[in-house]
Each structure stands twice: as C-alpha cells, then as structure tokens.
Interface confidence: low
C-alpha cells in the first residue's frame, strides 16, 4: 500500500558510469515519514536488497556505497522507503553501468567519438556527436564528465559495416560544454560497457559576448 507521499529521489554522487572494480555512492533522498530506507537492485524483474538504513530525523539522507563494481552489480537501482510496516514507496530507477573488459572480450575494442560540425560552437547551433565502432555493438552510451545524470543511450545503426549512433545536441547551450566519452554495449548485458572512447571536449562559446 502506498501512502500519499512525495516521489523519492535517487542519485549517484559521482558518475553512474563506473570502472570495473570501482565504487559509487548512491544517495536516497530522505522522506521525513519513512523510518527505513532500502536500496534494491532489480534483476530479472525481481528485487534484491543491497542495503538498508534505519532513518533518524537528525541524519543526512541515507547513502549506500557499492564497492568492487562488476557486471553483477550493474543494473537498475531503486530506493524503497518504509513508512508504516505495510506501507512503502519507491523512487525512480537509477541505472548504474560498469566499464571494462568482459570475460569473452567482445567489448575489448573502444569506440571512436567525433563531432559535427566542430568541437567549438556557439549557443543555439546544432551539434551531433558520432559514436562508431567496427565491432558488433547493440547500443552506444554517451556520458559527460562530471554529470551525475544517466548517460544517453542509443540503439546502433549498421552503416557499411560500421556500427554507429548519432547523438544530437540541438540547440546547444553553455550547459552542453564539457568532456564527452562514448561506450559500446551488447544486448546480452546492457549494463556492461566497453572501455570509453578517447575524450572529446566540446566548447560552447558565445563569440558575440567575447567581442
């Protein structure tokens, strides 16, 4: 049974793209009425508890640390809040993905990342980031350095033996400026990624302001 409580919030304290054997902190935004916060991972449509925190009012929002990240720990996470013993509320889901070589080595090759029309653009222009690989890829992910929000994910297109995805940033704003990387993934485990592409720096500069 769900009470009339606000939708809780879940976030990764750092990037949700985590290197193999790395760690990440997940924060479950507190609900005043909740006495217990549980972090769950959703695997094969079933919930598995990762941790739980008894909530005391003077404490900060409950945090959970996921250590030694691997393919088993990658996936969709949710915070579950107990309000009365029989009442609970779920947050949105947070996707955690892990980068690194999988045992079969099918993700060994890094993709390449390029930008059109130019890595230096003015606000309001249309920019496309192109992620490519010569190896079988089902989806590409694009992440921005320092961003805690989920990476963009696109299904790959097969173009003359190249697998690619075009990420459109249109129209660009100053918020789009930063360092981007892209990753390959296979449908067998969409939360397991290749090593990243070389970083690509996108500069969004307002030339009229500079002049």
């Amino acid at each position: 049974q769900e009470g009339d409580f606000p939708m809780p919030f879940i976030s990764a304290k750092s990037s949700p793209v985590i290197p193999l054997d790395g760690s990440v902190k997940i924060q479950c935004q507190a609900i005043r009425e909740a006495y217990l916060t549980q972090l769950m991972i959703i695997k094969n449509s079933t919930y598995r508890e990762i941790g739980r925190r008894l909530k005391f009012w003077n404490e900060t929002d409950p945090e959970f640390v996921i250590d030694h990240m691997d393919a088993n720990k990658a996936g969709r996470y949710q915070c579950q809040y107990r309000i009365g013993h029989y009442r609970f509320r779920y947050s949105d889901t947070l996707e955690l993905v892990v980068t690194g070589e999988e045992p079969a080595g099918r993700l060994r090759d890094r993709p390449s990342l390029s930008v059109r029309p130019s890595p230096s653009v003015a606000p309001g222009e249309n920019v496309t980031l192109l992620c490519q690989s010569g190896n079988r890829t089902d989806t590409f992910l694009l992440s921005k350095e320092g961003a805690a929000h989920r990476p963009l994910r696109l299904r790959s297109q097969d173009q003359d033996g190249w697998y690619q995805a075009e990420f459109s940033l249109s129209p660009v704003t100053s918020a789009h400026g930063g360092t981007y990387r892209c990753y390959r993934s296979l449908s067998t485990n969409p939360y397991l990624l290749s090593q990243p592409s070389e970083p690509l720096a996108l500069l969004v500069a307002d030339y009229t302001m500079q002049n």
């Epitope: 009425e33 598995r48 579950q80 009365g84 013993h85």
Partner: antibody, heavy 122, light 112 residues
C-alpha cells in the same frame, strides 16, 4: 536479555476503562515495532495493532478502532493499550509482542510479553 | 485479509516419534524486500506464545534443533524430528508480509 513485562490481571465492569502496560528491556525500544495481540478464552490469536515505535504511529485493524487506544512512553520504553467503555467480549488475555522495524533479520523475530488477563464482568 | 490455514487441527504423537504440520496462506508471503515473513509459535498450556521459527526457516535462539521450518510462497511446514513431552501445546503460524498480520487457527500437539 530481551524482555517484555506486562502489567497484572484486571477485573473490570462493563463501561469502565482499562490501561495495560508493556515495558521493554534488553534492546533499543525505538528500533523495533510493538504489536498487540488478543486471545479470547479458549480461542486463537488475533492481531490488533502494530505501533511504529519511532514515530508513534499505530496501524490497526478495523476491529480495534474507536474504543482502543495504542500509545507509547518512549522514555520509559513502554507501550500501552487502553480500552474504553469495556464490553463483556473484551474479556481476553492481551499480549504485547516485539516485531517489525529494524535494519536486520533480527526485526523479523518475535518476542512476547507474558500476557495480561482482562475479565469484564458485572 | 490473508487467510492462514493450518492442518491438522490436532496431532497425536508418541514421544520420540516425528511430527509434521502444515500452514498454507491464501496469497504469496514473499515480500517486496525479498524476505518471507512467516513465523511459527508454540503456546504451551497456560503460557504466553514463544517464538520457534522466523523468516520461514530460521531457528530462534534456544530452540532445539529438532524443530525445522521450510516452505516458500504459500506452502509452509514445521517438522519436529523427535517429539518430547515439553513440545505439547498449540502451534501457530503467522504472516507479517501483508496488512493485517494474520495467524493460523493453530495445530494442537497431543502426546499419545
């Protein structure tokens, strides 16, 4: 060790009020829920309410609304069951039981008080 | 409410012999947190209930090894490998997964 000690037997007349206490010891009172369970003579167990000892919020069944008041004195690690306007059918043994809340499987274990026998008779 | 059905109503067993009783729930007791809140109690004559098993199969402290709980979903079993005189009383199963918490009607264990 964990103990729940309840107040002694009560003999009351219909229309009167009774307040039964349950004093907990051996654990952090706020970290575990408290339940009240009724057992009429020769009958089975019937769950009445669960109290979130952290917030003081009771969750009870429709059968135990109105005349039944579930409260806490957290500083004394004590839970109370008060029944107003007593009726003959309230004659029963009332148990408090620690269960629920908590951060480990320990919260799923149940510990029971010795019971308080209430007799309502004119 | 979730209905808990215990069978048999009465169990007559000779000291030293095994005993088995069943508890069935009208809905699955697997909670959203992955746990199954199904416990077993023993109420000896004139005494308060005493916890035997919690979370389907976990023995409470001080409970003899001859008591074992098993089951999942809606079907649960309590077994006593060798009945002793102190085991007589009424055994209750109860669930805490769904609101409200409900008890089975009990199985009375008698000594032959």
């Amino acid at each position: 060790q964990i103990q729940l000690v309840q107040s002694g037997p009560e003999l009351k007349k219909p229309g009167e009020t009774v307040k039964i206490s349950c004093k907990a010891s051996g654990y952090t009172f706020k970290n575990y829920g408290m339940n009240w369970v009724k057992q009429a003579p020769g009958k089975g167990l019937k769950w009445m309410a669960w109290i979130n000892t952290y917030t003081g919020e009771p969750t009870h069944t429709d059968d135990f609304k109105g005349r039944f008041v579930f409260s806490l004195e957290t500083s004394a690690s004590t839970a109370y069951l008060q029944i107003n306007n007593l009726k003959n059918e309230d004659t029963a043994t009332y148990f408090c039981a620690r269960w629920g809340l908590g951060t480990t499987e320990e919260a799923a274990r149940d510990y029971w008080g010795q019971g308080t026998t209430l007799t309502v008779s004119s | 409410d979730v209905v808990m059905t215990q069978t048999p109503l009465t169990l007559s067993v000779t000291i030293g012999q095994p005993a088995s009783m069943s508890c069935k729930s009208s809905q699955s007791l697997l909670d959203s947190d992955g746990k199954t809140y199904l416990n077993w109690l023993l109420q000896r004559p004139g005494q308060s209930p005493k916890s035997l098993i919690y979370l389907v199969s976990k023995q409470d402290s001080g409970v003899p090894d001859r008591f074992t709980g098993s089951g999942s979903g809606t079907d649960f079993t309590l077994k006593i490998s060798r009945v002793e005189a102190e085991d007589l009383g009424v055994y209750y199963c109860w669930q805490g997964t769904h609101f409200p918490q409900t008890f089975g009607g009990g199985t009375k264990l008698e000594i032959k």
